[in-house]
């Protein structure tokens, strides 16, 4: 995909871009494309929006194939209609402490963000807002039909839940790392980001990793067992190779993915880890990218699209990254 060959564009006319997205020439100066936005994957052929001061951050020089659209150093953030300077910390609500860094916002929860799964002593956990309190708390609803509890108990399993990393102090540095953001795609390859100062210079930096919550082609609802409403972590029958902009992972992976529900709940990664994956491109180039691997998923009603500007995002975030 280098720029030395003759320019030829897709047969269809120039794309119509969503409002606020620039129509730009690709990185080869060949074809008109919709510019990639902050946090999206970018390539030489899929450039970032220059009118928003974005550039394609390829990470290490050896990985000049696929990058992430990143704001130039010092770019401000627009969050909830307010502009924040790069490096500025603010409380988006009583629940979140946020930091703006080069156009990206990373937030730490001030409330416990655990996902509580059913257990014998609390078969129907539910988060409720208590009067005069900022943080929601778990309550245990009584089952409507007591007979459910007996035979169904075997299906319950107490899950380890992890909140944000505990605050650490290291050599005059208050180490803080935000949670990994939700995967940018609900299916297929996306990216997830976080902000941390866990480095030698104690400087805030953005980190990103590839993520795949579930493959797009999988028809997961078919696998839901009779009488059940969810499939939390469907079994993937065969090892798969990941694809990224024409490049293929060198190894095959028996990865776990999150399932679906038929009752309005959404299933999202609960415990994850981050591992390097090597991709081989058609021209023989090999690049290494960090990628999220799912350990467990949780199905819950805290789906995106709720009223809280940040909460709807946050409940889709990854807990307890083991990397």
């Amino acid at each position: 995909q280098n720029c030395s060959g003759p320019c030829r564009c897709p047969d269809e006319p120039a794309p119509r871009c969503p409002a606020g997205v620039s129509l730009v020439l690709d990185g080869c100066g060949c074809c008109r494309v919709c510019a990639k936005q902050l946090g999206e994957l970018c390539t030489e052929r899929d450039p970032c929006d220059p009118h928003k001061g974005l550039f394609c951050d390829f990470g290490s020089p050896a990985n000049r194939k696929i990058g992430v659209c990143t704001a130039k150093d010092g770019a401000p953030c627009i969050f909830g209609g307010t502009v924040y300077r790069s490096g500025e910390s603010f409380q988006s609500s009583c629940k979140y402490q946020c930091t703006c860094l080069d156009g990206a916002v990373g937030c730490m929860p001030l409330c416990s963000m655990d996902v509580r799964l059913p257990s014998p002593d609390c078969p129907f956990p539910r988060r409720v807002k208590l009067p005069g309190k900022c943080c929601e708390e778990w309550v245990c609803d009584e089952p409507k039909d007591q007979t459910v509890v007996g035979p169904a108990l075997a299906a319950y399993r107490l899950e380890d839940t992890f909140g944000p990393d505990p605050t650490m102090i290291r050599a005059n540095c208050l180490v803080q790392t935000t949670e990994w953001s939700a995967c940018s795609k609900t299916c297929g390859m996306g990216i997830s980001t976080r902000v941390t100062n866990d480095n030698a210079s104690c400087r805030l930096e953005k980190q990103s990793r590839l993520c795949m919550v579930r493959p797009c082609e999988a028809d997961l609802e078919e696998n839901i067992k009779k009488g059940k409403k969810c499939i939390r972590t469907p079994k993937i029958s065969k090892p798969i190779k990941f694809e990224l902009s024409g490049c293929t992972s060198m190894k095959t992976y028996r990865a776990k993915f999150c399932g679906v529900c038929t009752d309005g709940r959404c299933c999202t990664p609960h415990r994850t880890t981050t591992l390097p994956v090597e991709f081989k491109c058609p021209d023989g180039e090999v690049m290494k990218k960090n990628m999220m691997f799912i350990k467990t998923c949780a199905c819950h009603y805290n789906c995106p699209g709720d009223n809280d500007i940040f909460e709807s995002l946050y409940y889709r975030k990854m807990y307890g990254d083991m990397a």
Partner: antibody, heavy 119, light 111 residues
Amino acid sequence: EVQLVESGGGLVQPGGSLRLSCAASGFTFSDYYMAWVRQAPGKGLEWVANINYDGSRTDLLESLKSRFTISRDNAKNSVYLQMNSLRAEDTAVYYCARDTSRGSYFDVWGAGTTVTVSS
Amino acid sequence: VVMTQTPLSLSVSLGDQASISCKSSQSIVHYNGNTYLEWYLQKPGQSPQLLIYKVSSRASGVPDRFSGSGSGTDFTLKISRVEAEDLGVYYCFQGSHFPLTFGQGTKLEIK
């Protein structure tokens, strides 16, 4: 009606310069690449250069890169070929052509302008 | 990429079929997977006109008696029933690699 009209050809001495122009009409000029193709007397067609929508990318026949330049002015619906250090072998009819940049290359051609390099 | 046409001249009776071959010195598959092989006709005293693009797609207004085929390095233009207006020089062209190149041309004459 879609039309391309070339001008600027003529007789020039070896080492001299010429600037060919091509005026386009009947279509949205900035939505198309443009190109120059030449044909020496009694010979076949030879691609010379093409230029993208806004002029930010140009591609030329390698052997002509040091002497020829293609440019465009979308406000004037025109494309140009600046030819310097002309040689006898540059004698040809120069055609301006519209390049779709998608499925096909040269879907519309001008009538051509003749360039003669001779002392 | 060198484009070699055969024959260089062709004399055909009206209503007969004509066939022109074009061979490329290497594969002309573009990096996007498409093959940009085109055919142009230059009638006497006129500018060239596009007949076929991407091996087998007919350009707008081109009669269906013109057809293109082939793959890899071997391509063919067929005129199923030659008419008087078809005379002229036919050029194949590749747009998949730099430099963009034309064949040397095949002159079609009417017997």
